[in-house]
């Protein structure tokens, strides 16, 4: 969470941004809020990126002005125009690229004053893992797969019964480059699993952490997955 203050004569407004992460190839949002101003035509929103000449996006007089927009953002950005008057200057970013990572500035000018705040935007790839029983293996095995990760994550297995056990000797993890030559598919196989136990496959890089749980009993297989972004907010 970053709060910036701006001073315009005697006037300053608070601008707040949130550090966030973008998933390569998906659509993302760079969050920014400011003190509301009912005079829409008096609000100017400018998004800038460190090291880039030209603007990421500009919104003024109630509409976009993309005349100064940098080529790399062409056709990829939009503000939530109907939410500007209530203080939402967040930016939608289409088809997030690795090169979109960096420091952005959300600059606001309203009839109340000026203000700005920076945000750090990380880009990578992260996806939910899916664990299945691998019936093709010679012994009872679990296969954990996640389709898209970048940078290369670490993979670790854990068990509810054998808490603290090191499964690195009885597991095998591989990383397969996807067709766009950036993200990778993660596959990890855990061997010699026992029935009536809950196993967890944990995939983590510096952007996200994902966990897949599986419980295998005689009568059923229960699965659960979750994903959390790291260092956000």
């Amino acid at each position: 969470l970053i709060i910036g203050f701006g001073i315009s004569g005697k006037h300053f407004i608070t601008v707040t941004t949130f550090t966030s992460a973008g998933n390569i190839g998906e659509d993302g949002t760079l969050s920014c809020t400011f003190e509301p101003d009912i005079k829409l035509n008096g609000i100017v929103i400018q998004w800038l990126k460190e090291g880039i000449k030209g603007l990421v996006h500009e919104f003024k007089e109630g509409k976009d002005d993309l005349s100064q927009q940098h080529e790399m953002f062409r056709g990829r950005t939009a503000v939530f125009a109907d939410q500007v008057v209530v203080g939402n200057a967040s930016l939608r970013l289409k088809n997030v690229q690795l090169t979109d990572a960096g420091t952005y500035t959300c600059y606001i000018h309203t009839s109340k004053g000026k203000g700005n705040a920076n945000l750090e935007y990380k880009t990578g790839a992260f996806s939910m893992p899916e664990i299945n029983v691998d019936y093709n293996a010679s012994s009872e095995s679990l296969r954990c797969e996640a389709p898209r990760w970048f940078p290369q994550p670490t993979v670790a297995w854990a068990s509810q019964v054998d808490q603290g056990a090191n499964f690195s000797e009885v597991s095998n993890t591989s990383f397969e480059l996807n067709s766009e030559n950036v993200t990778m598919k993660v596959v990890s196989v855990l061997y010699n699993v026992t029935i009536n136990n809950t196993y967890s496959c944990m995939i983590e890089n510096d952007i996200a952490k994902a966990t897949g749980d599986i419980k295998v009993t005689d009568s059923e297989v229960k699965r659960r997955s979750q994903l959390e972004l790291l260092n956000s907010g």
Partner: antibody
Framework: QLQLQESGPGLVKPSETLSLTCTVS??????????WGWIRQPPGKGLEWIGN???????YYNPSLKSRVTISVDTSKNQFSLKLSSVTAADTAVYYC????????????WGQGILVTVSS | EIVMTQSPATLSVSPGERATLSCRAS??????LAWYQQKPGQAPRLLIY???TRATGIPARFSGSGSGTEFTLTISSLQSEDFAVYYC?????????FGGGTKVEIK
């Protein structure tokens, strides 16, 4: 309501340059949230995006046509134009102009289209 | 470039019946997809954008769904004016590309 109208010659000789103009009425071409695009459709076939322009003059072209395409804008006349050089029979198509959202980038509305035949 | 594939090429449906049109992208386009309707001798008309948002003035019988690589346009109860060719278009990355179209004809 916003309307677009294509104009230009319906017949162009091979190796010459195809030139079309799109006139925008019922709204300003300087509306900030939109690009202005060209799309074509060969007879009985599908649609191909040619490229777009912003009112400030910045352009983006389909790489498959980039070496032959020029799109320009005249804000004083509320018009934008397409030039396609070194045409062949494969460029025979109905050419449409359309307003293109800056994002989302859907095309709406479209001009009625103009059939351009490349033939000697 | 992203290749858009539509199926079937032709769909024969009786008036009042449901029509389901498919569009597949060669790679994920998130929800950055639009659907258009084109009648003979006319320009295409925008029906859906953002994969599922109906354009202004489009009847509720038209609905879009899907994300990533698989998309569907559903016409819940075909009216006589709905018999036309339908195109999907991705605007996820340049160059924007269209599918080959699905012709919906009277059975």
């Amino acid at each position: 309501q916003l309307q677009l109208q294509e104009s230009g010659p319906g017949l162009v000789k091979p190796s010459e340059t195809l030139s079309l103009t799109c006139t925008v009425s019922g709204g300003s071409i300087k509306s900030g949230s939109y690009y202005w695009g060209w799309i074509r459709q060969p007879p009985g076939k599908g649609l191909e995006w040619i490229g777009n322009i912003y009112y400030s003059g910045s352009t983006y072209y389909n790489p498959s046509l980039k070496s032959r395409v020029t799109i320009s804008v005249d804000t004083s006349k509320n018009q934008f134009s397409l030039k396609l050089s070194s045409v062949t029979a494969a460029d025979t198509a109905v050419y449409y102009c359309a307003r293109e959202g800056s994002y989302p980038n859907q095309f709406d509305p479209w001009g009625q289209g103009i059939l351009v035949t490349v033939s000697s | 470039e992203i290749v858009m594939t539509q199926s079937p090429a032709t769909l024969s449906v009786s008036p009042g019946e449901r029509a389901t049109l498919s569009c597949r992208a060669s790679q994920s386009v998130s929800s950055n997809l639009a659907w258009y309707q084109q009648k003979p001798g006319q320009a295409p008309r925008l029906l859906i954008y953002g994969a599922s948002t109906r354009a202004t003035g489009i009847p509720a019988r038209f609905s879009g769904s899907g994300s990533g690589t698989e998309f569907t346009l559903t016409i819940s109860s075909l009216q006589s004016e709905d018999f036309a060719v339908y195109y999907c278009q991705q605007y996820h990355s340049f160059p924007f590309t269209f599918g080959g179209g699905t012709k919906v004809e009277i059975k």
